[in-house]
């Protein structure tokens, strides 16, 4: 395939990466399988330059972000290393508290209103944003 | 133009609190966030934290965890940084500067702080 | 955290002289890079920010370039007012942390 010269309609650019925001909410797993199918992933934050990016188009509102602890250690869903990357949660956070009643703890992160990270039920319909590269080869074939 | 007016220079006696004040002007205060940022004497420079003062979140650094304290006061456009249980080692010029892309663009001129019994 | 280091800590140099500092991350931040020129008693000033953009009312002679780790402050014709203390910052991720600082003086 070839790389994208430019992002999809509707797309934001920003520092060489295309951005999605919903305006809907659903839970984790169905917004990471939407990205997925839009040939791209759950936006994954490497710098204070993307949070505030996403930040100032999100506004006040909870939003799903490619953060996870599911399977026990917190991932990116690029594979983006979390240890040693950017990180901006909230006081106290990330938590896995057991007393919302649902079951289970908190896997899934979010930005929250103040742009700050939480962890929470992955099954809350949140917002969510999409984020492909746009250096990433795309699926389309070449023109001839 | 952007300015960022600090309060006047503080002694301090070990244990005490110091409470520095960062009076921004030229720009809309509430769409950038503020940084802390001290400078010991003959020393380098040392980030504290940030307040956003849209919405008052605040992340600090983990060394001033728990005695650092960033609050705002948006009508008066104005940024506080509060340091509790003050130590000898705390006594540096402590600057604010405002948000830029990936920097710190404007400085305020700074605020001695003597920490001395 | 992102530990920073320059070198050299000091340079002895003559007006007109071009002047080259480096200053390494110790993990990648991109170009997420400023630099800043700091007087005695008076508060840093921003140089370069995004490892090359220049600042606006900064001279020039004053570039920066670099990407990743490594990273290049570079002032082409050195002039009487640039004898000062400079540092690189990255803003990649918190905490936020700076270099040691490199001191320009007059050989």
């Known amino acids: 395939g070839s790389e994208r010269a430019c992002c999809p309609v509707n797309w934001v650019e920003h520092e060489r990466s295309c951005y999605w925001f919903s305006r809907s909410g659903k839970a984790w797993a169905d917004a990471d399988n939407y990205c997925r199918l839009e040939d791209a992933h759950l936006v994954v934050v490497t710098s204070w330059e993307e949070q505030k990016f996403v930040q100032h188009h999100i506004g006040p509102v909870n939003t799903w972000m490619g953060l996870h602890d599911q399977n026990g250690p917190w991932k990116w869903v690029d594979g983006t290393d979390y240890e040693t990357g950017f990180k901006n949660w909230r006081p106290e956070q990330p938590d896995d508290w057991y007393g919302h009643g649902l079951g289970g703890g908190e896997d899934c992160a979010h930005f929250t209103d103040d742009g700050r990270w939480n962890d929470d039920v992955c099954q809350r319909p949140y917002r969510w944003v999409c984020e492909t590269e746009l250096d990433k080869a795309s699926q389309e074939p070449p023109l001839l | 133009q952007v300015q960022l007016v600090q309060s006047g220079a503080e002694v301090k006696k070990p244990g005490a609190s110091v409470k520095v004040s960062c009076q921004a002007s030229?720009?809309?205060?509430?769409?950038?966030?503020m940084h802390w940022v001290r400078q010991a004497p003959g020393q380098g420079l040392e980030w504290m934290g940030w307040i956003n003062p849209n919405n008052n979140a605040t992340n600090y650094a983990q060394k001033f965890q728990g005695r650092v304290t960033m609050t705002r006061d948006t009508s008066i456009s104005t940024a506080y940084m509060e340091l509790r249980r003050l130590r000898s080692d705390d006594t540096a010029v402590y600057h604010c500067?405002?948000?830029?892309?990936?920097?710190?663009?404007?400085w305020g001129q700074g605020t001695l702080v003597t920490v001395s019994s | 955290d992102i530990q920073m280091t320059q070198s050299p800590s000091s340079v002895s140099a003559s007006v007109g002289d071009r002047v080259t500092i480096t200053c390494r991350a110790s993990?990648?931040?991109?170009?997420?890079l400023a630099w800043y020129q700091q007087k005695p008693g008076k508060a840093p000033k921003l140089l370069i920010y995004a490892a090359s953009s220049l600042q606006s009312g900064v001279p020039s002679r004053f570039s920066g370039s670099g990407s990743g780790t490594d990273f290049t402050l570079t002032i082409s014709s050195l002039q009487p007012e640039d004898f000062a203390t400079y540092y690189c910052q990255q803003a990649n991720s918190f905490p936020f942390t700076f270099g040691p600082g490199t001191k320009v003086d007059i050989k």
């Open positions: 030229g720009y809309t205060f509430t769409g950038y966030h």
């Open positions: 500067a405002r948000d830029g892309t990936s920097s710190f663009d404007y």
């Open positions: 993990q990648g931040i991109r170009k997420w």
